[in-house]
Interface confidence: medium
Amino acid sequence: RKIPKVGHTFFQKPESCPPVPGGSMKLDIGIINENQRVSMSRNIESRSTSPWNYTVTWDPNRYPSEVVQAQCRNLGCINAQGKEDISMNSVPIQQETLVVRRKHQGCSVSFQLEKVLVTVGCTCVTPVIHHVQ
Amino acid sequence: GITIPRNPGCPNSEDKNFPRTVMVNLNIHNRNTNTNPKRSSDYYNRSTSPWNLHRNEDPERYPSVIWEAKCRHLGCINADGNVDYHMNSVPIQQEILVLRREPPHCPNSFRLEKILVSVGCTCVTPIVHHVA
C-alpha cells in the first residue's frame, strides 16, 4: 500500500507543493515536537503486576538509530504476595512507529520508510481458556 | 544525525550522517501490520487494567488514524471482577514517529513528527508511605 494522496479538492495551492519525482516523496527528517512531555508514572516497569525489562536496539542504517523494546519478565503475573501467578498471563502491548531505512546498493544510497512494531510494556490479562467439547 | 558505515571503495563525497531532507520510496516496508488494536487483540478488555480505545484521526498525518488508550478505572480488576483501589491502572505512553504533510495538503512532501500516544494500561502497586 502506498501513502494515500490527498484528493485534489483538498488542496489550497497545489502549485506551492515541491516537485517530487514519480514513485517517491520528499521527507524532512528534522523532527517536529522533538521534546514531548511524558506524564507517565515512574518505574512502572518494575511496579507493574506484569513487569518488563527494556532493551535498546541500535542500527546505524536506521533513523532513529536507537529503538527501545520492552520484554515481559514473566509468563504469569505477580500477585499481592510478590509471587508469580501462572493462572494469569503477562502479555506485551505493542505500537507501530515509522523509521527511515538507509540502503546501500554499491556506491549509491536510497532511503525507505519502514513500519516497526515496538513493544512498549506489558499488561496482565485473564487467559483465554478453550475447553474440550 | 547518526554515523553510517561506508563502503571504502566509494567516493568520499557521501555524508556519514543522515541528510536533513531525503527522497524516499512511496512504498512502506512492513506496511501490512494490523493498525486496528481492537481487531489485533482483545487485551484491552481482558486486562486487569482494562482500557477503552479512541480513534484519533488527522488527514494531514500518516498514518491518519491512531488508536489512543484510556484506562477504564482508577484501580485494577481483582479475581472477583471488582475494582480494587489498592492497585492503580496507569497508562503506558510511547513516543512514536509519524509523517506530517509539509507544506500542508501536499501529497508527496512530509516531515517526521514525534507524537505521544497512550498505547494501553498496566496495573501497578501504588507508591504509598504509611505513618511510622
Epitope: R37, S39, S41 | N56, E68, A69, K70, L74, N88, I127
Partner: antibody
C-alpha cells in the same frame, strides 16, 4: 480533618519576588501530588503547577514557566511556590490543592482538598 | 483562551435538569480522565466529579458526569437553588504538559 492552609500572599511591585507556603494536615502528605491553582479577580480558574508525591516530577503552566518554582518539604508537610519576576497579570488568589489519589496520580484524577487561598497583588 | 471549551452560562428552574458540555481534543479529554469542580462566589472550588463519572463521598447523586471521545458533560438533575455556582471541567493535557481548566460555566437557577 484534612486541611490545607496557604500563607505568604501580599502586595508586591512588578519584578519582585514572593514565596507562598501551604501547610498540610490530616493526611499523609508525602503520598500525594500537590497543585497550585490561581484565580484572577472576576476570572476563571488557572492551573499554575504540580509536583509529584516525592518531588521528582514538576510541571508548570506556560505563563509561569521559568519564573515560578514549585517545591515541597515532606518532613514539614509543606508545599511551596517561589514566584520571581512577578507581573501585574500574576495578581490572583492562589490556592494549593491535593490530588485525590495517592502515588502515581500526581497529574490528574481530581483535586479533592483545597485551601482557602492567599491573595497576591502585583502593582506599582 | 482555554483548550477546554465550555458554554459561558446555563440555566434552569428548580427541579429541572441542566447539562454542561466540555469540549477538548485527543491530547486532553481523549486521553485523560475529566474532573468537574463547583465554585460558589467567595469560596474555594469543590471537587464534584473525578475520573469522568466518579462522585466523591458527600456529593449528591443529582450530579453525574460522562465522557465520550474528546468531549465530556456534567448533568445536574433536580436543580436546586444552592446549585447556583460556576462549574469547571479540567483534565491533563499532554501537548501543554499540564493540568487545564475549562473556561467555566455559570449556572443560574431561575424563579
Amino acid at each position: 480533618e484534612v486541611q490545607l492552609l496557604e500563607s505568604g500572599g501580599g502586595v508586591v511591585q512588578p519584578g519582585r519576588s514572593l514565596r507562598l507556603s501551604c501547610a498540610a494536615s490530616g493526611f499523609i502528605f508525602r503520598n500525594y501530588g500537590m497543585h497550585w491553582v490561581r484565580q484572577a479577580p472576576g476570572k476563571g480558574l488557572e492551573w499554575v503547577a504540580v509536583i509529584s508525591y516525592d518531588g521528582s516530577n514538576k510541571y508548570y503552566a506556560d505563563s509561569v514557566k521559568g519564573r515560578f518554582t514549585i517545591s515541597r518539604d515532606n518532613s514539614k508537610n509543606t508545599l511551596y511556590l517561589e514566584m520571581n519576576s512577578l507581573r501585574p497579570e500574576d495578581t490572583a488568589v492562589y490556592y494549593c490543592a491535593k490530588v485525590g489519589a495517592s502515588g502515581d496520580y500526581y497529574y490528574s484524577y481530581g483535586l479533592d482538598v483545597w485551601g482557602q487561598g492567599t491573595t497576591v497583588t502585583v502593582s506599582s | 483562551q482555554s483548550v477546554l471549551t465550555q458554554p459561558p452560562s446555563a440555566s434552569g428552574t428548580p427541579g429541572q435538569t441542566v447539562s454542561i458540555s466540555c469540549s477538548g481534543s485527543n491530547s486532553n479529554i481523549g486521553r485523560h480522565p475529566v474532573d468537574w469542580y463547583q465554585q460558589v462566589p467567595g469560596a474555594a472550588p469543590k471537587l464534584l466529579i473525578y475520573y469522568d463519572d466518579q462522585r466523591p463521598s458527600g456529593v449528591p447523586d443529582r450530579f453525574s458526569g460522562s465522557q465520550s471521545g474528546t468531549s465530556a458533560s456534567l448533568a445536574i438533575s433536580g436543580l436546586q437553588s444552592e446549585d447556583e455556582a460556576d462549574y469547571y471541567c479540567a483534565t491533563w493535557d499532554d501537548s501543554l504538559g499540564g493540568y487545564v481548566f475549562g473556561s467555566g460555566t455559570k449556572v443560574t437557577v431561575l424563579g
